[in-house]
């Protein structure tokens, strides 16, 4: 997701088909306030960014509103009137869905079903990860809708759960970003808990000389 040009490193993120964030690391332009100009239609005039991201008092990015029908971003980053980087991109390639909202759990014997409100657009995977104190790594299960059932759980064990949303590669390509994880929720015997014991790490084998 990083484009390079004239000492400029660019990163694009398209948050939930709502907001585009373009950030830059302008190593060749220290102490310069680069300006960001953009449009969503080739025939329009460029608009200048109105919401800049600042780093150490200097511009390092722009946040701009997008609509779901906006799919190509034309942009130019300028030092004064001099363009230092100009590009046009399909912004769907840089999608980052929002985190799962209204997450709820329902327990039934040795299984738990996590549900949340589906996002309003297609091509997403809803991933649930879970682990007990006996697991050194998270286990994972994912579905096309936010209705994910994890089976074969031991009701006596304490399980930590977290969820996120990912863009399907078939729908958006391989260079998207997963959403942030939801808050970790802990459950034991069908009831919520503040926390589970930390996973046990296997003892390191002693090396014989």
């Amino acid at each position: 997701q990083v484009a390079t040009g004239e000492g400029l490193q660019i990163q694009i993120m398209y948050f939930n088909l709502e907001t585009v964030q373009v950030t830059w690391n302008a190593s060749h332009y220290p102490r310069s306030n680069l300006s960001f100009h953009y449009k969503f239609s080739r025939d329009e005039a460029y608009d200048q960014c109105t919401v800049y991201i600042l780093q150490e008092g200097h511009t390092s990015g722009c946040l701009l509103d997008a609509e779901q029908q906006d799919d190509i971003l034309y942009f130019s980053i300028r030092n004064g009137t001099h363009p230092v980087f100009t590009a046009s991109r399909w912004i769907f390639y840089y999608l980052k869905p929002s985190s799962p909202k209204q997450v709820s759990f329902s327990w039934h014997q040795d299984a738990v079903t996590l549900t949340c409100s589906d996002l309003s657009y297609r091509g997403l995977l809803y991933e649930v990860q879970y682990r007990s104190p006996f697991d050194t790594e998270w286990q994972s299960k994912q579905e096309n809708t936010c209705n994910v059932t994890v089976e074969d759980l031991d009701a006596e064990k304490c399980y930590a759960f977290r969820a996120r949303v990912k863009a399907m590669e078939d729908a958006y390509g391989p260079d998207t970003y997963p959403s942030d994880w939801s808050e970790v929720t802990c459950w034991q015997r069908g009831e919520t808990r503040d926390s589970c014991p930390e996973p046990r790490t296997p003892p390191k084998p002693k090396l014989s000389k």
Partner: antibody, heavy 122, light 107 residues
Framework: QIQLQESGPGLVKPSQSLSLTCSVT??????????WTWIRQFPGKKLEWMGY???????YYNPSLKSRISITRDTSKNQFLLHLNSVTTEDTATYYC??????????????WGQGTLVTVSS | DVVLTQTPATLSAIPGERVTMTCKAS??????LHWYQHRPNETPRLLIK???RSITGIPSRFSGSGSGTDFTLGINNLEAEDFAIYYC?????????FGSGTKLEIN
């Protein structure tokens, strides 16, 4: 098994319009998510993407062709059409129609026609 | 536009050899780079999508790698039918663009 077939005149006079048709069999051009494209190959073998029309009729054109290009479709015949105005000898090329791979918002082109050579000459 | 530079322009080899060719993008394009084979008098054929993902029906001797700006197509154990022109194409930049091609010819 999808097949694409281009058809149209092989010779066009400068300043006239070029119209080509791509007939698609074995697959509906209205299938959700798929985009239909025109690509041309110049005599020196360079390939140029010209434009797309989507399953939803949305079109995208190469800015280099400015306002000369139009892509339309005829769903009753399962065809999509290329119109290129004010042609010059620089438009002499082999014209291909192709299908864009589903997803990734118009990525790679997984099915192509055989191509039709169009010569612009007086 | 994102410019794709393919090298070498011509590659000479003999059947049974392994060859590699490269495609360099003027701007970073992640892994959204695709490879095509175009034999004379045939329709272009998609070989590799997204830098390294295989395509159903394409022999396993074709492989791709790379990300960002530098990409490679490799062909193991060359067969007579592999002698053709190979093109790379990027998709995140608008408009989509193709490289100028690498012609693989029999030595």
């Amino acid at each position: 098994q999808i097949q694409l077939q281009e058809s149209g005149p092989g010779l066009v006079k400068p300043s006239q319009s070029l119209s080509l048709t791509c007939s698609v069999t074995g697959f509906s051009i209205t299938t959700s998510g798929y985009y239909w494209t025109w690509i041309r190959q110049f005599p020196g073998k360079k390939l140029e993407w010209m434009g797309y029309i989507g399953y939803n009729s949305k079109t995208y054109y190469n800015p280099s062709l400015k306002s000369r290009i139009s892509i339309t479709r005829d769903t009753s015949k399962n065809q999509f059409l290329l119109h290129l105005n004010s042609v010059t000898t620089e438009d002499t090329a082999t014209y291909y129609c192709a299908r864009s791979l589903y997803g990734g918002y118009k990525d790679a082109f997984d099915s192509w026609g055989q191509g039709t050579l169009v010569t612009v000459s007086s | 536009d994102v410019v794709l530079t393919q090298t070498p322009a011509t590659l000479s080899a003999i059947p049974g050899e392994r060859v590699t060719m490269t495609c360099k993008a003027s701007q970073s394009i992640g892994t959204s780079l695709h490879w095509y084979q175009h034999r004379p008098n045939e329709t272009p054929r998609l070989l590799i999508k997204f830098a390294s993902r295989s395509i159903t029906g394409i022999p396993s001797r074709f492989s791709g790698s790379g990300s960002g700006t530098d990409f490679t197509l490799g062909i193991n154990n060359l067969e007579a039918e592999d002698f053709a022109i190979y093109y790379c194409q990027q998709s995140p930049g608008f408009p989509p663009t193709f490289g100028s091609g690498t012609k693989l010819e029999i030595n």
